[in-house]
Every structure is written in C-alpha cells, then in structure tokens.
Interface confidence: low
C-alpha cells in the first residue's frame, strides 16, 4: 500500500511522509521562497551591499525581503500540491509497475526533492543572512542616532544651564538698575529741592540787586546834584568875594541867571561841570518826561550819551517794538536807551555817532559817523548816517542808504524773510544787512560761525559775534 501525509514537527518545519508498503520516506522542507529570476533586486548568491544610509530605505528593503519570503512560501505550497498530484499518479503507476522499479523511482523523486530543498535552504540562509545584516546595520544606525540624541540633549542641558545663569545675572543687573534708579530719583529730588532753594535765593538776591541799583541810581543822581550844588556854591562864593573886594560893591547888584536844572544830553551835563562818568537823568526835548542814561565823560573828551551797550549777555535783546521805542535794560550794564528819545534828540541838533567794538582776542575798533539822526516813529525810526571814519571798516556796516528799524513784532526790512526773527534783536535791517549789534550774545569759543550773533561785518566778517559794543552820541559842535 502507499499513502502520503503532511504534518508539522516540533521545530515548526513541514514534514512530507511517503508510505509505500513497508517503506516510509520522510522529507523535512523549510518554508522557502521560490527561485528568483535574475531580474530580482537581489541575486540569491549576490554579495550583500552596504547598509543604506537612510532609515526609510532600510524599512523599504525589509519589506521587499518579506515579499520575497512570502513568494517562496507560496511557491512551496504550489510544490506541495504538485507533489501530491504527481504522487497520486505515480503511486498508480508504481502499483502497476514492477516492485523493483518502485525503489529507483522513489529514490529519484527523493533525490530531486532533496536537491530542490537544499537549494531553497541555501537561498533562505542567504535571505536570513541579508535580513540579519540589515537588522545589524539598522541597530548600528539606531545606536548612532541614540548617541547623537544624547549629545543634543547634553547640549540643550548646557544651554539651559547657561540661560539660567544669564537669567540670574540679568535679575541681578535689573536689581542693580532698580537700586540705581532709586538712588538717582532720590538725588534728583534732592537736586530739585536745592534748585528750588537756589531759585528762591536768586529771587531774593535779584530783589536786593534791584534795590541796590535803585539806591545807586539815586546816589549817583544825588552825587550829581551835590556836585552841581558845590559848583554853584563855588561860583556864588567867588562872585561874592569879587563883589566884596570891588570898591563900588554897594552900588553893584548881584544878578545871577537861573541855574539849569534839566539836561537834554550828557554833553550839557559835562558842560555844566559834572565830568564823572555815570548814570544821569535826561529830559526829553520840549517836555518834562525824563529818562536815565549812562554818560561817558572819559572817551574822546567826554560828553557822550550812551544809547546802546552790550558786554555780557545778561539782558535779552530780542524785544518788542514798544520796548525798543521806550528803552530797556540797566544803564549800569547792558541796555537800549530808546528810539523815541534818540529820534527827538537827534531831530533838533546835529549829532555824531560813535560805535566802539571789542572782539574776543583783545582788539578794539571804532566807527565814527559825522552826522547821525533817527526819523520819527511814523518812518519806523529810519537811520541816517554820513561821513564814516574809524578803524572798524572803510565801508559802513550799517547799510546805506539807511534802513527802517525792525523788531520781532514789526518787520520793516527789505527782505522777504523776517530779519529780526531770523537774526535776533531789533536793528536797522536791510536784507538782512552787514551788521546787527543787538543780536544773540555768544560767549568766547562759541562766537564764530554764528549768523545771528553781534555782527559788524566790515571789521570781523559775518560769522563773528563780538564781545562788547557801545553806541554813543554827542552834539557835532561839542
């Protein structure tokens, strides 16, 4: 008899048993893939390639291997079916054939099966080796990735540590800044308080200075009057002495003309015998209105009425038309006498104008005009000058013919612009003209390249701001 059965051994391999009479043939076959054609991605006996660099590649190739294994399994199943079919046929033939031939046929079939099985086993071993190789390489890659990850983690930890340190430092510095701000605020508060105290002190001192100035003015005036009274007394005494010593003194009548008590200008004061430079009271022509002026009794024979003086920048000269009309400042320091008074004074008699200038290098110069007068307010106090001599330039730095007077609130210049606003101060601006003695006062080392400074163009050029200026007038026939 003969039969064929299939079973699975303890190792999980398939067993093929052929029972033929007293003889039993057992074949143990591994589950292998079918033979691959040469077009297959991997030849069964090909040398294993280098492991792919990409993880995804490795996965892909593993899937290919799995597919190959699956194909092998399917092929074996087909082979199993084929063997079953053939065995049935051959068993019939064997039964029909002579008993002697059975053994040979069975051996032949067994040999064929063994050869095929051996081949399949070799292929499977190759595949297993490839899979193992791939797995090993993947494990190596994973290990490398793990090492890289560890390094990155360490770097992140280091950076986190640095960030923490920086945050600590930052917190420390912030605290310091806050402390400093606190101290700074305290200091500022203290300084503000000191400033307030100083301002109060300055206010008090200003009041005291004002009082002292008033007292000084009064004292000067009193001194002037005393000088005059002394002069008058001396004249009276001399007159009396002359009368007493005269033989016909009894018949002589002492006639003394009325003493002058008001003065039109400093020249009259000088001629009255008061020859000390200082502040004197002048009276407007044909009026009882008075004005205080500084009289220079020393320069060039004396008798000069000072109409403008700059020396230290203590007085703001960017004033209104009204202020320039009436005068401002202090005759003891910087001041403007007043356009109205000068206009009235120079409109009655012929006056000369002397302008004295000082630069920051210790040089002095002057310009002298032999005829000077100001027109009335209806003509914007237009200036008229002739006959220039002196050391402060051969060309007049006050534009010729004369210009109208302009202030920040009364623009009468020949410029499209507003010269007074642009160049600062009230002046006889042209467009805008070569001079401005009422410009912005600039201290030493800040006095060059200033277009709005105290300028006398034909002596020091346009950008030079002078240290001191004085404008003074005196009758031409003094």
């Amino acid at each position: 008899y003969s039969n064929f059965r299939k079973s699975v051994d303890s190792t999980g391999r398939r067993q093929y048993q052929v029972q033929n009479g007293p003889c039993s043939y057992t074949f143990l076959l591994p589950e292998t893939d079918s033979c691959r054609s040469s077009s297959s991605p991997y030849m069964s006996n090909a040398v294993q390639r280098d492991a792919p660099l990409d993880y995804d590649d490795s996965v892909q190739r593993l899937q290919v291997l799995e597919n190959i294994l699956e194909n092998n399994t399917q092929w074996l199943m087909k082979l199993e079916n084929y063997i079953q079919d053939n065995m049935k046929k051959e068993m019939v033939e064997i039964q029909q054939n002579v008993v002697q031939n059975q053994t040979a046929v069975m051996i032949e079939i067994g040999t064929s099966l063994l050869n095929q099985t051996a081949a399949q086993t070799r292929k499977l071993t190759d595949v297993e080796a490839q899979v193992l190789n791939q797995t090993t390489r993947l494990e190596l890659q994973l290990l490398q990735h793990s090492i890289s990850t560890n390094k990155l983690e360490k770097q992140i930890l280091d950076q986190t540590s640095e960030i923490n340190k920086l945050q600590n430092k930052n917190s420390f510095l912030e605290q310091k800044v806050l402390d400093m701000e606190g101290k700074h605020s305290e200091q500022l508060q203290s300084m503000k308080e000191q400033k307030d105290e100083l301002q109060v002190l300055v206010s008090k001192q200003s009041s005291v200075i004002d009082e002292l100035e008033k007292k000084l003015v009064t004292a000067t005036v009193n001194n002037s009057l005393l000088q005059k009274q002394q002069h008058d007394l001396m004249e009276t005494v001399n007159s009396l002495l002359t009368m007493m010593s005269s033989p016909n003194s009894k018949s002589s009548v002492a006639i003394r003309k009325e003493e002058q008590t008001t003065f039109r200008d400093c020249a009259e004061i000088f001629k009255s015998g008061l020859t000390t430079s200082g502040i004197y009271t002048l009276t407007f022509p044909n009026s009882t209105e008075e004005i205080k002026a500084y009289c220079d009794m020393d320069v060039g024979g004396g008798g000069w009425t000072v109409i403008q003086h700059r020396e230290d920048g203590s007085v703001d000269f960017q004033r209104t038309w009204k202020e320039y009309k009436e005068g401002f400042g202090s005759p003891l320091g910087e001041y403007w006498l007043g356009n109205e008074f000068v206009s009235q004074l120079t409109g009655q008699h012929r006056y000369v104008l002397k302008i004295q200038l000082k630069d920051w290098e210790g040089n002095e110069a002057h310009s002298l005009y032999d005829h000077f007068y100001l027109a009335g307010e209806e003509s914007n106090y237009r200036i008229h000058l002739t006959g220039l001599t002196g050391t402060a330039g051969k060309i007049s730095s006050i534009s010729q013919p004369g210009s109208d007077f302009s202030t920040k609130d009364s623009d009468n210049d020949k410029c499209i612009c507003k010269c007074s606003q642009m160049l600062s101060g009230g002046w006889w601006f042209d467009a805008c003209g070569p001079s401005n003695l009422n410009g912005q006062y600039y201290p030493q080392k800040q006095n060059t390249n200033k277009f709005n400074g105290i300028k006398w163009y034909y002596w020091k050029g346009s950008g030079y701001s002078l240290k001191a200026t004085t404008m003074m007038i005196r009758p031409a026939d003094f």
Partner: nanobody, 126 residues
Framework: DVQLVESGGGLVQPGGSLRLSCAAS????????IGWFRQAPGKEREGVSC????????YYADSVKGRFTISRDNSKNTVYLQMNSLRPEDTAVYYC???????????????????WGQGTLVTVSS
C-alpha cells in the same frame, strides 16, 4: 574741508547762453548767502548777483539785470547763475563766494565773504 567749486564756463558766441554752477562741500548752504562775482582782465572785481540764505532774496548788478538769473538748490548744495543774451563785455573769470552771515548787501561788495571758489572762465566772442 570747506570748498566752493565753479563749473559751466566756456566759449560762447554773442547772444548765446551759459549756466554756471557753484557746488559747496564741507558745509550746508542753507544759512549762507552766495554771491557771483567777476573780474575781467585789467579791471576790478565786481559783484554780479547775490542770493540770500533762507528767504532767497536776490540782487543783480544793473549791467546784468534781465539777462542773468541766480537760483539755489539747497538739497544739491548748489547755486546757479543762468546767463542769457551774453555780450562780449561779459567776458571775465566768474567766482562764487559765500557769506555765513546769510545777508546780501546792495552791491554784492564781497569784501567780507568767507569762502571763495577758484573761478571759471567765460569768453563771449564771435
């Protein structure tokens, strides 16, 4: 370094035109007056035209009125002198000068001008 550079001069026939340029470097022209002056051979230097600083008021010598035009372009730091209807008597070396006072006076005297260019020759001849 403060510098003024004139350009645009050359030979031109009577009745022709030229445009002179005065380019400033080292300072901004905004607050400066600029004057054009000329000096013919054997003659004194004379003021031709000036332009004040921010307001742009201009002056012209009687001999060039109606023919010459002065203008300024503060963004280019340059002043121009457009000369039309040129005559042989306009032949001279033309200079530009700047006055940091920003003013111009009636005759563009130029005695106190702070900086001067090297000049450009204008020849009017047939």
């Amino acid at each position: 370094d403060v510098q003024l550079v004139e350009s645009g001069g050359g030979l031109v026939q009577p009745g022709g035109s030229l445009r002179l340029s005065c380019a400033a470097s080292g300072f901004a022209l905004d607050y400066y007056a600029i004057g054009w002056f000329r000096q013919a051979p054997g003659k004194e230097r004379e003021g031709v035209s000036c332009i004040s600083s921010s307001d742009g008021i201009t002056y012209y010598a009687d001999s060039v009125k109606g023919r010459f035009t002065i203008s300024r372009d503060n963004s280019k730091n340059t002043v121009y002198l457009q000369m039309n209807s040129l005559r042989p008597e306009d032949t001279a070396v033309y200079y530009c000068a700047t006055d940091s006072g920003g003013y111009i006076d009636y005759d563009c005297m130029g005695l106190g001008y702070d900086y001067w260019g090297q000049g450009t020759l204008v020849t009017v001849s047939s």
